[in-house]
């Protein structure tokens, strides 16, 4: 199709080489098409970015995204050629930064409903470059945490080194929806609730003599509880002795509850003690079996192919640890009579 009639928008993604970050393009179709193609909907805070459901079909994306090769080749279908770019209804989500994302991206309605819709498309010229090392060291992260129940703020990473006074007007989106009532480089949240979690996008305009660009940054905001003050507690095994049958396989499960920590480095190991010897056992990886806002339950199993007489003389020890301290639970095997 002819893209010469598409409206054009220039965007700049200055990514940090110090951290992982994502980027989002919105298909800002001109009205009135936008209203019947991109109805914004609400998702739970964990689902990001917002789905933008289609009026006629629940399954089809509303818009089709293309990338225009710089050499003049035909338009490329994003889904087929770029696995690190996810098409999510009316948004295009870049999972990894890099100058190779620089290029022109075109979106248009998936279904043409009227002759007028044929020319309804948006061309986004995206320039991607690493942030210069000269930019301030304390720039805001692309992953920001808000402590539930307290006051917090969300800063626009590309503007966090500027004072509120010198900052340009900022356009904010949350989960794909415009936050029209907030226009400064920092959003203050007087009391943090779970619903403040989500994907925030901040845009501001940067102009030079030749042209004007929208500088965009994406911030993943997580609402968290305060770090635990407790060491982990072992939920299973509860008993210190376990009745077993000789010659049969045996799995002993260790389950422990770890309180929330912003920097979470849980340790869970199985040891065997035999007389004066003690060694760590190679066992399957630990797995998270339940995760909530306040804590996480982690399980790790020790597997014996068959229980031997020697195992009855040994003590099996589950060891768990977080930044506060450690807890152990010992299990002695006893032959079933």
């Amino acid at each position: 199709f002819n893209i010469s009639g598409c409206s054009t928008k220039k965007l700049l993604w200055a990514y940090s080489t110090r951290s992982e970050e994502e980027f989002i393009l919105f298909c800002d179709l001109p009205e009135p098409q936008k209203s019947h193609f991109c109805h914004r909907s609400q998702l739970s805070p964990t689902q990001v970015p917002d789905h933008l459901p289609f009026t006629d079909s629940k399954d089809l994306p509303d818009v089709q995204w293309y990338r225009q090769p710089s050499n003049g080749d035909p338009l490329e279908d994003i889904r087929k050629s770029y696995p690190h770019i996810i098409q999510d209804k009316c948004t295009l989500r870049f999972l990894t930064p890099g100058v190779n994302n620089t290029g022109s991206y075109i979106c248009r309605p998936k279904m043409i409903k009227s002759p007028y819709d044929v020319a309804c498309c948006v061309k986004m010229i995206l320039e991607v470059k690493p942030q210069s090392n000269a930019s301030c060291e304390n720039s805001a992260s692309h992953k920001q945490d808000l402590l539930l129940g307290s006051t917090g703020s969300i800063s626009c990473p590309s503007l966090s080194c500027q004072s509120d006074a010198q900052s340009p007007e900022v356009t904010w989106y949350k989960n794909g929806k415009l936050l029209s009532m907030t226009r400064s480089n920092r959003i203050v949240v007087d009391e943090v609730y779970i619903y403040h979690q989500g994907t925030y996008v901040c845009d501001y305009t940067q102009s030079d003599t030749a042209s004007s660009w929208t500088v965009r940054a994406v911030v993943q905001v997580r609402t968290i509880v305060g770090d635990t003050k407790l060491k982990p507690d072992i939920l299973d095994p509860v008993e210190s002795t376990l009745e077993v049958e000789l010659g049969k396989p045996l799995t002993i499960s260790c389950k422990a509850r770890f309180g929330f920590e912003r920097v979470f480095n849980p340790v869970m190991k199985w040891y065997i003690k035999d007389a004066d010897l003690e060694w760590e056992v190679s066992v399957p990886e630990a797995k998270s079996i339940k995760s909530t806002l306040k804590d996480e339950i982690i399980e790790r199993n020790i597997i014996l192919e068959k229980v031997t007489q020697r195992d009855l003389r040994r003590t099996f020890v589950c060891f768990v640890q977080n930044s506060i301290g450690n807890t152990t639970q010992s299990v002695q095997l006893k032959e079933k009579r």
Epitope: Q42, T182, Y193
Partner: antibody
């Protein structure tokens, strides 16, 4: 408890302006957006616009654009709505209503309402 | 603008009746729908937000359901104090818009 107290009834001539105040108490004034809604006699509810008390940012319904101005005074926790170039069809009860969730977020529900201010426009 | 259409515009019911009011949006609004009750000479009162969440202090006989374009408010057993006008309102996008109202009268 959370309360919104509005100014008293007004009678205005066509072409004049009216300014209605809404004083908030019992909560952190800057944490919640404030809506203005009006209701003509015997009619339904009509949303006029919203103000963010923290920055003073506003969004108005297209119908009132150019005629309505919403402002706030954080020192007195008061929001104001001024409507100019009044006509007879602006005769209505004007309500301020607090947004139900701490900003910034989507709009949810208006959980606390003022008692209403009757504005009569008559020559 | 998103148009909200309520039906019926009025209904007569008796104490103890189960009453259902419907609201239809002109486009999908996900679950961004609220219900209000208004009595003559009084300000509206929020009953339900997010289509189905009961506002604090509202009796459990009120319930809301729906998503997308079609929504309902149900009063499981009508009480004398429930005779009033009910409005739906979308908070999906500005301008926020209300339905025309449903007047619930005593039979």
């Amino acid at each position: 408890q959370v309360q919104l107290v509005q100014s008293g009834a007004e009678v205005k001539k066509p072409g004049a302006s009216v300014r209605v105040s809404c004083k908030a108490s019992g909560y952190t004034f800057t944490s919640y957006y404030m809506h203005w809604v009006r209701q003509a006699p015997g009619q339904g509810l009509e949303w006029m616009g919203i103000i963010n008390p923290r920055g003073g940012y506003t969004t108005y319904a297209q119908k009132f654009q150019g005629r309505v101005t919403m402002t706030r005074d954080t020192s007195t926790s008061t929001v104001y709505m001024e409507l100019s170039s009044l006509r007879s069809e602006d005769t209505a009860v004007y309500y301020c209503a607090k947004e139900g969730r701490v900003s910034p977020t989507d709009y949810y529900g208006m959980d606390v309402w003022g008692q209403g201010t009757t504005v009569t426009v008559s020559s | 603008d998103i148009r909200m259409t309520q039906s019926p515009s009025s209904l007569s019911a008796s104490v103890g009746d189960r009453v259902t009011i419907t609201c239809r949006a002109s486009q999908s609004i996900s679950s961004y729908l609220n219900w209000y009750q208004q009595k003559p000479g009084k300000a509206p009162k929020l009953l339900i937000y997010d289509a189905s969440s009961l506002q604090s202090g509202v009796p459990s006989r009120f319930s809301g359901s729906g998503s997308g374009t079609d929504f309902t408010l149900t009063m499981s057993s009508l009480q004398p104090e429930d005779f009033a006008t009910y409005y739906c309102q979308q908070s999906y996008s500005t301008p926020l818009t209300f339905g025309g109202g449903t007047k619930v009268e005593i039979k």
